[in-house]
Interface confidence: medium
């Protein structure tokens, strides 16, 4: 028969012959021959291969360096890599999450629009008129000014984006 020019899924062409690929979690030891099957071996500890493959070496699991603020989110297996994430209060500096930085705090006059996650930083927004923030925080939103009227009080000092209004008693007309 004619030697194949293409092979089925999960096979590869070598020496004019279709050999089975090694399954995820295993590496290639020797190609198949006319008389023998492809020889595969399981990846060692701390190694993985996540596809049907003909690799002669497994990949090393990622190291989530705790000294860079990283921690293991999910341990690797022979078929999957370790997934790293950042410790609480930190977020990844890149998509690959190779190191972490502390979450940014929103300064007074700014509130948190979106709380940081393990992969994204805090998003701050300026406090609009009628709202204020008097703290530097990675969690606090802008707070609305106190409504003096609902407390039967009047505004004694106007609020800013950093301070609340100051309420005081209404002046009574003396007889």
């Amino acid at each position: 028969p004619e030697p194949p020019t293409a092979c089925r899924e999960k096979q590869y062409l070598i020496n004019s012959q279709c050999c089975s690929l090694c399954q995820p979690g295993q590496k290639l030891v020797s190609d198949c021959t006319e008389f023998t099957e492809t020889e595969c071996l399981p990846c060692g500890e701390s190694e993985f291969l996540d596809t049907w493959n003909r690799e002669t070496h497994c990949h090393q699991h990622k190291y989530c360096d705790p000294n860079l603020g990283l921690r293991v989110q999910q341990k690797g297996t022979s078929e999957t890599d370790t997934i790293c994430t950042c410790e609480e209060g930190w977020h990844c500096t890149s998509e690959a999450c190779e190191s972490c930085v502390l979450h940014r705090s929103c300064s007074p006059g700014f509130g948190v629009k979106q709380i940081a996650t393990g992969v994204s930083d805090t998003i701050c927004e300026p406090c609009p008129v009628g709202f204020f923030s008097n703290v530097s925080s990675a969690f606090e939103k802008c707070h609305p000014w106190t409504s003096c009227e609902t407390k039967d009080l009047v505004v004694q000092q106007a609020g800013t984006n950093k301070t609340d209004v100051v309420c005081g008693p209404q002046d009574r007309l003396r007889a």
Partner: antibody, heavy 121, light 106 residues
Framework: EVQLVESGGGLVQPGGSLRLSCAAS????????MSWVRQAPGKGLEWVST????????YYADSVKGRFTISRDNSKNTLYLQMNSLRAEDTAVYYC??????????????WGQGTTVTVSS | SYELTQPPSVSVSPGQTASITCSGD??????AAWYQQKPGQSPVLVIY???RRPSGIPERFSGSNSGNTATLTISGTQAMDEADYYC?????????FGGGTKLTVL
């Protein structure tokens, strides 16, 4: 041969200060995080502090935070522990340990012989 | 703060299997290491990354870690294995040690 040699221990009065050193040899010192671990007489191991490879990241046990400072000089292959405001409960053998890094993941693969710190009046 | 709990002591006859446990909240999600310490000596790493053995550590030492418990197993225990054993893990950028287990070979 990979080796860690601690020095600087001794007898000090409560409230006093001491600086421990750890001389490293046999490996690329600047490529590894380093730690100090102590052991009080007859007690278990207690982690004290860790410093990352470049020295920019430092971590401390709550019991020493604000009193102890870990540092390193990669040009001298030396790790330090500056201990201030010492208390009787700081009395222990202090070990310097190398983090395993990408070879011995999440562990300390080399330990020094230890140096004894005694805090007493 | 994170805590690791070990039994204070474990006894075993020579040639038998010794198991030392270390428990902590969701410890299986972290990587555990084990150290051996003999009287008057520095600790020695015997297991890292849950189950891996550093070069020079005998095959009779093995480890596992799942759920809330990591286990150090010494099969065919020898008199020379008598020592204190400590488990260790990283938690929130701090290193945590268990209280230690004294292994007595009867």
């Amino acid at each position: 041969e990979v080796q860690l040699v601690e020095s600087g221990g001794g007898l000090v009065q409560p409230g006093g200060s001491l600086r421990l050193s750890c001389a490293a040899s046999g490996f690329t010192f600047s490529s590894y995080a380093m730690s100090w671990v102590r052991q009080a007489p007859g007690k278990g191991l207690e982690w004290v502090s860790t410093i990352n490879q470049a020295g920019g990241g430092t971590y401390y046990a709550d019991s020493v935070k604000g009193r102890f400072t870990i540092s390193r000089d990669n040009s001298k292959n030396t790790l330090y522990l500056q201990m201030n405001s010492l208390r009787a409960e700081d009395t222990a053998v202090y070990y310097c340990a190398k983090e395993g890094g990408k070879y011995y993941y999440y562990a300390m693969d080399v330990w020094g012989q230890g140096t004894t710190v005694t805090v007493s009046s | 703060s994170y805590e690791l709990t070990q039994p204070p002591s474990v006894s075993v006859s020579p040639g038998q299997t010794a198991s030392i446990t270390c428990s902590g909240d969701k410890l299986g999600d972290k990587y555990a290491a084990w150290y051996q310490q003999k009287p008057g000596q520095s600790p020695v790493l015997v297991i890292y990354q849950d189950s891996r053995r550093p070069s020079g550590i005998p095959e009779r030492f093995s480890g596992s870690n799942s759920g809330n418990t990591a286990t150090l197993t010494i099969s065919g225990t020898q008199a020379m294995d008598e020592a204190d054993y400590y488990c260790q893990a990283w938690a929130s950028s701090t290193v945590v040690f268990g209280g230690g287990t004294k292994l007595t070979v009867l």
